[in-house]
């Protein structure tokens, strides 16, 4: 049975990842960003089903197209965090939470989503989380 | 209802500079999340993306257009503007200005408003 | 520079499926979009994101994405289908829009 101390540090990572997935969303949807045509273009892969922390695997296979697409959107009127720190940080968070005992594979919807719908989705994700944590 | 009109010379010289321009009505082209466009069709063929103005003033092109295009916008007229250099008889087409609008606060980019287009021809 | 490529022409009777496929390297990766043109008319957009339907478009255009395909599918072809069609991506670095090279449909 998990201790309060693991849920308490496990309640803090998620609150970690849930604000670098809010920044990156607020970074790319606003219209301050002239490359979100571009970025939008991009198709992402949305877990059939999300509800556990092993789940988390479905992020971290989608980990190295965020980062493209998060490269695409530096330009000189347009700036977020630096993008290899940012997805190396999600990166760690995410490994840590989904833990290492089990491989996953994992499921994924037949319908693709743009950029902004899965950066929701998981938002959501580490929010309902969270809410089963406190 | 958003609407656009290309006006412009119907012929142009080859060498020299075809300038069109697309008057915007029922809409701002300053209003933010916009991309305004511009894209030609050969006769009888498909159809080109030259290139787009942000609201913000940001411009993307073409990398086939090797820097010859130019747009540009005139907030006080609510105009956006395609300059296109040294033209020759494969710059013959029909130029057609359109707006990229956005499906909702999650959806994608997509060309919602055209113009009727204008036929550009370049013959000595 | 990159491209996406469609079959010149598909022709097929009323009431039948017709099909038109569109391929490209990047589109595993890369939302299709599918305009529609009439003879002497602008585009308008029929299928936004592979599969999306927007407004206003009747319920017999669907598309659908597969690996480097796209496809659109109208389902009961009516003769005011006849028309051009075209597929738009971009590539992978999202740096080339581009259109494919239309197909005619042929509504006979």
């Known amino acids: 049975a998990p201790t309060s101390s693991s849920t308490k540090k496990t309640q803090l990572q998620l609150e970690h990842l849930l604000l670098d997935l809010q920044m990156i969303l607020n970074g790319i949807n606003n219209y301050k960003n002239p490359k979100l045509t571009r970025m939008l273009t991009f198709k992402f892969y949305m877990p059939k089903k999300a509800t556990e922390l092993r789940h988390l695997q479905c992020l971290e296979e989608e980990l190295k197209p965020l980062e493209e697409v998060l490269n695409l959107a530096q330009s000189k009127s347009f700036h977020l965090r630096d993008t290899k720190d940012l997805i190396s940080n999600i990166n760690v968070i995410v490994l840590e939470l989904k833990g290492s005992e089990t491989t996953l594979m994992c499921e994924y919807a037949d319908e693709t989503a743009t950029i902004v719908e899965f950066l929701n989705r998981w938002i959501t994700f580490c929010q309902s989380i969270i809410s089963t944590l406190t | 209802q958003v609407q656009l009109q290309e006006s412009g010379p119907g012929l142009v010289k080859p060498s020299q500079t075809l300038s069109l321009t697309c008057t915007v009505s029922?809409?701002?082209?300053?209003?933010?999340?916009?991309?305004w466009s511009w894209i030609r069709q050969h006769p009888g063929k498909g159809l080109e993306w030259i290139g787009y103005i942000y609201y913000s003033g940001s411009t993307d092109y073409n990398p086939s257009l090797k820097s010859r295009g130019i747009i540009s916008g005139d907030t006080s007229k609510n105009q956006f503007s395609l300059k296109l250099n040294s033209v020759t008889a494969a710059d013959t087409a029909v130029y057609y200005c359109?707006?990229?609008?956005?499906?909702?606060?999650?959806?994608?980019?997509?060309?919602?408003?055209w113009g009727q287009g204008t036929l550009v021809t370049v013959s000595s | 520079s990159y491209e996406l490529t469609q079959p010149p022409s598909v022709s097929v009777s009323p009431g039948q499926t017709a099909r038109i496929a569109c391929s490209g390297d990047a589109l595993p990766r890369k939302f299709a979009y599918w305009y529609q043109q009439k003879s002497g008319q602008a585009p308008v957009l029929v299928i936004s994101e592979d599969s999306r339907r927007p407004s206003g478009i009747p319920e017999r255009f669907s598309g659908s994405s597969s690996g480097t395909m796209a496809t659109l599918t109208i389902s009961g072809a009516q003769v005011e289908d006849e028309a051009d069609y075209y597929c738009f991506s971009t590539d992978s670095s999202a740096n080339h829009r581009v259109f494919g090279g239309g197909t005619k449909l042929t509504v006979l």
């Open positions: 359109a707006r990229e609008g956005r499906f909702g606060e999650l959806g994608s980019y997509y060309f919602d408003y």
């Open positions: 029922g809409g701002s082209i300053s209003s933010g999340g916009y991309y």
